[in-house]
Interface confidence: low
Amino acid sequence: RPSFSLVEDTTLEPEEPPTKYQISQPEVYVAAPGESLEVRCLLKDAAVISWTKDGVHLGPNNRTVLIGEYLQIKGATPRDSGLYACTASRTVDSETWYFMVNVTDAISSGDDEDDTDGAEDFVSENSNNKRAPYWTNTEKMEKRLHAVPAANTVKFRCPAGGNPMPTMRWLKNGKEFKQEHRIGGYKVRNQHWSLIMESVVPSDKGNYTCVVENEYGSINHTYHLDVVERSPHRPILQAGLPANASTVVGGDVEFVCKVYSDAQPHIQWIKHVEKNGSKYGPDGLPYLKVLKAAGVNTTDKEIEVLYIRNVTFEDAGEYTCLAGNSIGISFHSAWLTVLPAPGREKEITASPDYLE
C-alpha cells in the first residue's frame, strides 16, 4: 500500500484559492432522460464564468439555461452526457472546475425501454404443457460484448420461458456470482430476467453467464463485460458520501465513504481540528487530525465507515474521507452537527482542552 505522510495536525497544502475539486475525479451528476438538472459552478470569486461541454463552448439554447454560476439542463437526453467545465475568469488568472453529466436510464443490455413491459418476458404456460426452458426474446441477447465506461450501470438480460417457470442464476467467469464479489453488490430482477450492476469498476470485467433451468432442462447464455477505463487514475469516491449528519449529545453517528480504485487505495479519515484556539495555522492552512487509517489488521469494509460513539459537542465539525493510490489523492468531506440532548439545553459542557 502506498502510505501518506499525513500525520496529526499536518496540513493538506491546497493551492490558492483552496478548493477540493481540482484534486479529485470530477463530480458525477446523474439524471434520467426527461429530467431537469441544475449544477452550480463550484469556484470562488467567479467574476465571469464560461462553460464548455467536452471541450466545446457551451451557450444557452432552448434547453440549456446559463444564469450566473448555475447551469440548467431542461428535459435532459443522453446526448447531454459528457464532461462539462466551468471556467472563472479573473483579472489575473482563471480557474476551471470539471464535472460529469450522465443522462441514462441505467440500461446497457441492448434494451432502451423502461422495462415496464415485463409481461412480454413472462410467458404463461398451460400447466399440462411441460416444457424445458427456452429463450423468449433472443434479440435482446444478440449483443454479447459490452464495453461500458467505468461508473456506468450495466444490465444483462436473458428473457426466458418454460413450464414449470424456470429459475435463473448468474455466474461470473464460470463461478457462482455472489453479492459480496463486488462493491455495492448487484440486483437481479427475476421478473425481467435481468442482472443489474451499478457503478461498474475495472474489477467487474469478465464473462457473465445466465443459467436458466427447470426440471426439464437447462440453457445458458454468456455476456462479456469490458469496463472501459482510461489510464491509471486517482481513487474515485462515490458522489454524496460521506453525507452530512446530525445527532444529539450522547448519540452515535457513522460516516460512510465508498472508494473505487484500480491501484490499491490507502484510506484515511481526517477531522479538521483546532490548535491553540485556531482552526488554521500561520500559513492559513487547516489543522488536520488523522482519526482512522487503514492498517495491517484493517479490512477495506472497516475503513470505509467511521463510527463516532457517545458524541460530544467537541465532535462537531468537518470530517474528511481521503483516499490515495500511486497516482494521486481524492477526498470528500461532510459535517457533523451536534444538538443538545432533549431537556438539557441549558447545561454547558466545558472541554478540558479549553480550560485555563
Epitope: 502506498p2 493551492e15 470530477p26 470539471y98 482510461r230 491501484a263 500511486s326 494521486g328
Partner: antibody
Framework: EVQLLESGGGLVQPGGSLRLSCAAS????????MHWVRQAPGKGLEWVAV????????YYADSVKGRFTISRDNSKNTLYLQMNSLRAEDTAVYYC???????????WGQGTLVTVSS | QSVLTQPPSASGTPGQRVTISCSGS????????VNWYQQLPGTAPKLLIY???NRPSGVPDRFSGSKSGTSASLAISGLRSEDEADYYC???????????FGGGTKLTVLG
C-alpha cells in the same frame, strides 16, 4: 498559471552523473503525479519515470531502471531526476510533466538538454 | 522500436482531412485510454486528445480521436498550415508498468 521549469542539464561524460530539477508552480504540487519524459535529438518522445503525489510509488522505463532515480520535495514544489551511469543514448531533452486529474501529461515544461559525450 | 506504431509521415493540403493511425496491443491501447500530443517545431508537446476521443478545453473541434480494439486514430479536418507538427500517441502499458509512446508522425501541410 501552471508552470514547470526544468534545470540541471548540461554536458557530461559517459559513466558520469547529473541531477535534473523541475520547479513547479501554479497548482497543488503535493497532489499531483509527476513524470519525466525525454526526447533524443530528432527522435520521438520516450517516457522515463513517474512518481506518485507523496513519493511512495515510482515506476521507471526499462531503459533507465537501476540507473535513474525519480524523487520529489513537496515542501519545495520540486521534482528531481538523479541520473547515474550515463550513456550516450541518454542524450536528450528532458521534460517534466504534470498529470492532471482528468488528463495525463497535461502540462509540460520547456525541457532541459542533457548531452552525454566524451 | 516503439511499442506503439505510427506512420512516420503524413501530408495533406489546406482544408483536407488527414488521419494518423496508432497501433498497439491489448496491454496498452486495448485495455487503457490513448492520448494524442501535438509538438510544434521547437516547443514542448501539448495534449490534444485524452481517453481516445476527448478534447481538452481550448483544442479546436477540427481534431478528433477514436479507438477500436488495439488501434487508435487521430483525425484532423480542415487542415491548416499551423497544424504542421509532430503528432504522438501514448498509452499506459499494463505489462510494462509504464507509459509508452508511438514513434511520432510528422505532418506536412502542402502548398
Amino acid at each position: 498559471e501552471v508552470q514547470l521549469l526544468e534545470s540541471g542539464g548540461g554536458l557530461v561524460q559517459p559513466g558520469g552523473s547529473l541531477r535534473l530539477s523541475c520547479a513547479a508552480s501554479g497548482f497543488t504540487f503535493s497532489h499531483s503525479g509527476m513524470h519525466w519524459v525525454r526526447q533524443a535529438p530528432g527522435k520521438g518522445l520516450e517516457w522515463v519515470a513517474v512518481i506518485s503525489y507523496d513519493g511512495s510509488n515510482k515506476y521507471y522505463a526499462d531503459s533507465v531502471k537501476g540507473r535513474f532515480t525519480i524523487s520529489r520535495d513537496n515542501s519545495k514544489n520540486t521534482l528531481y531526476l538523479q541520473m547515474n551511469s550515463l550513456r550516450a543514448e541518454d542524450t536528450a531533452v528532458y521534460y517534466c510533466a504534470r498529470e492532471a486529474p482528468l488528463y495525463d501529461f497535461e502540462y509540460w515544461g520547456q525541457g532541459t538538454l542533457v548531452t552525454v559525450s566524451s | 522500436q516503439s511499442v506503439l506504431t505510427q506512420p512516420p509521415s503524413a501530408s495533406g493540403t489546406p482544408g483536407q482531412r488527414v488521419t494518423i493511425s496508432c497501433s498497439g496491443s491489448s496491454s496498452n491501447i486495448g485495455d487503457n485510454g490513448v492520448n494524442w500530443y501535438q509538438q510544434l517545431p521547437g516547443t514542448a508537446p501539448k495534449l490534444l486528445i485524452y481517453g481516445a476521443s476527448n478534447r481538452p478545453s481550448g483544442v479546436p473541434d477540427r481534431f478528433s480521436g477514436s479507438k477500436s480494439g488495439t488501434s487508435a486514430s487521430l483525425a484532423i479536418s480542415g487542415l491548416r498550415s499551423e497544424d504542421e507538427a509532430d503528432y504522438y500517441c501514448a498509452a499506459w502499458d499494463d505489462s510494462l508498468d509504464g507509459w509508452v509512446f508511438g514513434g511520432g508522425t510528422k505532418l506536412t501541410v502542402l502548398g
